[in-house]
């Protein structure tokens, strides 16, 4: 599942190349292992902003698929309460390119621990 | 064809650079507030084909209290007082419903 999430992220990266989306998105660039589910929640929430602002059906579908995949992968530990983690709104806002790069890194973190 | 002034969003302001069709503008959350993750500050001037009237799209933006400020512990009461001055809580700017800045 996580491997498919990476391929969806690559697809989103390719699709937004031709678009001008100037949004800045809350980005956790240094994820602590004890806060990875909380960080993933922020990435998934902010991914929806890309979908909303692109107005593109392919991006919309890919974002929804990615969220479905991540949700199912996290259904076992999605309700784990991580304490002492930053809320999404406390994170630094970064451009879409940096956001997607950091997103790939956190997914790889999940791949390495699954 | 141009758009009218955009709608108000609670705890946010907007400085419109262009009212022309297809113009994309962003709301900014007021000081002490942050854009809620997953919501978009973007609004676009679009044409309603049925009525031929331009309007701004409704942003999904929600501005919430900055969690960094919410989490801050109040400083312990000071033993030194300044005569004649009563410390006031920092007042937040209006919600955005009361005022808008529309720059042409």
């Amino acid at each position: 599942n996580w491997v498919n999430v990476i391929s969806d992220l690559k697809k989103i990266e390719d699709l937004i190349q031709s678009m001008h989306i100037d949004a800045t998105l809350y980005t956790e660039s240094d994820v602590h292992p004890s806060c990875k589910v909380t960080a993933m929640k922020c990435f998934l929430l902010e991914l929806q902003v890309i979908s909303l602002e692109s107005g593109d059906a392919s991006i919309h579908d890919t974002v929804e698929n990615l969220i479905i995949l991540a949700n199912n992968s996290l259904s076992s530990n999605g309700n784990v309460t991580e304490s002492g983690c930053k809320e999404c709104e406390e994170l630094e806002e970064k451009n879409i390119k940096e956001f997607l790069q950091s997103f790939v890194h956190i997914v790889q973190m999940f791949i390495n621990t699954s | 064809i141009t758009c009218p002034p955009p709608m108000s969003v609670e705890h946010a302001d907007i400085w419109v650079k262009s009212y022309s069709l297809y113009s994309r503008e962003r709301y900014i959350c007021n000081s002490g507030f942050k854009r809620k993750a997953g919501t978009s500050s973007l609004t676009e001037c679009v044409l309603n084909k049925a009525t031929n009237v331009a309007h701004w799209t409704t942003p999904s933006l929600k501005c919430i209290r900055d969690p960094a400020l919410v989490h801050q512990r109040p400083a312990p009461p000071s033993t030194v007082t300044t005569a004649g001055v009563t410390p006031q809580p920092e007042s937040l700017s209006p919600s955005g419903k009361e005022h808008h800045h529309h720059h042409h």
Partner: antibody
Framework: EVQLVESGGGLVQPGGSLRLSCAAS????????MSWVRQAPGKGLEWVAT????????YYPDSVKGRFTISRDNSKNTLYLQMNSLRAEDTAVYYC???????????????WGQGTLVTVSS | DVVMTQSPLSLPVTLGQPASISCRSS???????????LEWYQQRPGQSPRLLIY???NRFSGVPDRFSGSGSGTDFTLKISRVEAEDVGVYYC?????????FGQGTKLEIK
């Protein structure tokens, strides 16, 4: 008024195939994900398949995975369900339903067709 | 898979009286983004299902306000404040937070 009309149901032998169609009208078909839901005679509802707006992504429960294929033709405003290797337990009324997007309003099947009956029997 | 369990399976109600249907999921259906995709569908005799409530408590357009949804986590409830004759039918809860999406077994509401 949103309209969804299923067709293609009928009697088929076990191991056989059938293709259901769902004609959509009065809404922009390509803007919505679509689903198939079935109901065995006198029983409850069972989700069968979902397809994304553009048709690139499909989702199935294990009970039909590998046997059923959901697809769509946005130029014809039509949803399909190709059913292969049919079994007696696939006997049901098959409904197509329009699915509201997660990103714009939370998942939900807001409009349903009248259903088409599929009977698998020798 | 998430198993949805409804109770009661049969609910005889007097016209004008309230009715309450419970739906319990085998695990929390709060998704990673904090949303709970829980719907309620009504199926009148001989008809197709119809959406009543989405995301736990949001009434779909055209649904009378005597219908209300509540709950969180694993426990959800559909309430009808005053049952009318047209409310007769089977009510299903449905989760689409996690694939495979699953329905409850249904609760048959009938008039006493």
């Amino acid at each position: 008024e949103v309209q969804l009309v299923e067709s293609g149901g009928g009697l088929v032998q076990p191991g056989g195939s059938l293709r259901l169609s769902c004609a959509a009208s009065e809404f922009t078909f390509s803007n919505y994900a679509m689903s198939w839901v079935r109901q065995a005679p006198g029983k409850g509802l069972e989700w069968v398949a979902t397809i994304s707006r553009g048709g690139d992504y499909t989702y199935y429960p294990d009970s039909v995975k590998g046997r059923f294929t959901i697809s769509r033709d946005n130029s014809k405003n039509t949803l399909y369900l190709q059913m292969n290797s049919l079994r007696a337990e696939d006997t049901a009324v098959y409904y197509c339903a329009r699915r509201v997007s997660m990103i714009t309003g939370g998942w939900a099947m807001d409009y349903w067709g009248q259903g088409t009956l599929v009977t698998v029997s020798s | 898979d998430v198993v949805m369990t409804q109770s009661p399976l049969s609910l005889p109600v007097t016209l004008g009286q309230p009715a309450s249907i419970s739906c319990r999921s085998s695990q929390s259906i709060v998704d990673i983004t904090g949303n709970t995709y829980l719907e309620w569908y009504q199926q009148r005799p001989g008809q197709s299902p119809r959406l009543l409530i989405y995301k736990v408590f949001n009434r779909f357009s055209g649904v009378p306000d005597r219908f209300s949804g509540s709950g969180s986590g694993t426990d959800f409830t559909l309430k009808i404040s005053r049952v009318e004759a047209e409310d007769v039918g089977v009510y299903y809860c449905f989760q689409d937070s996690f694939v495979p999406y699953t329905f409850g077994q249904g609760t048959k509401l009938e008039i006493k």
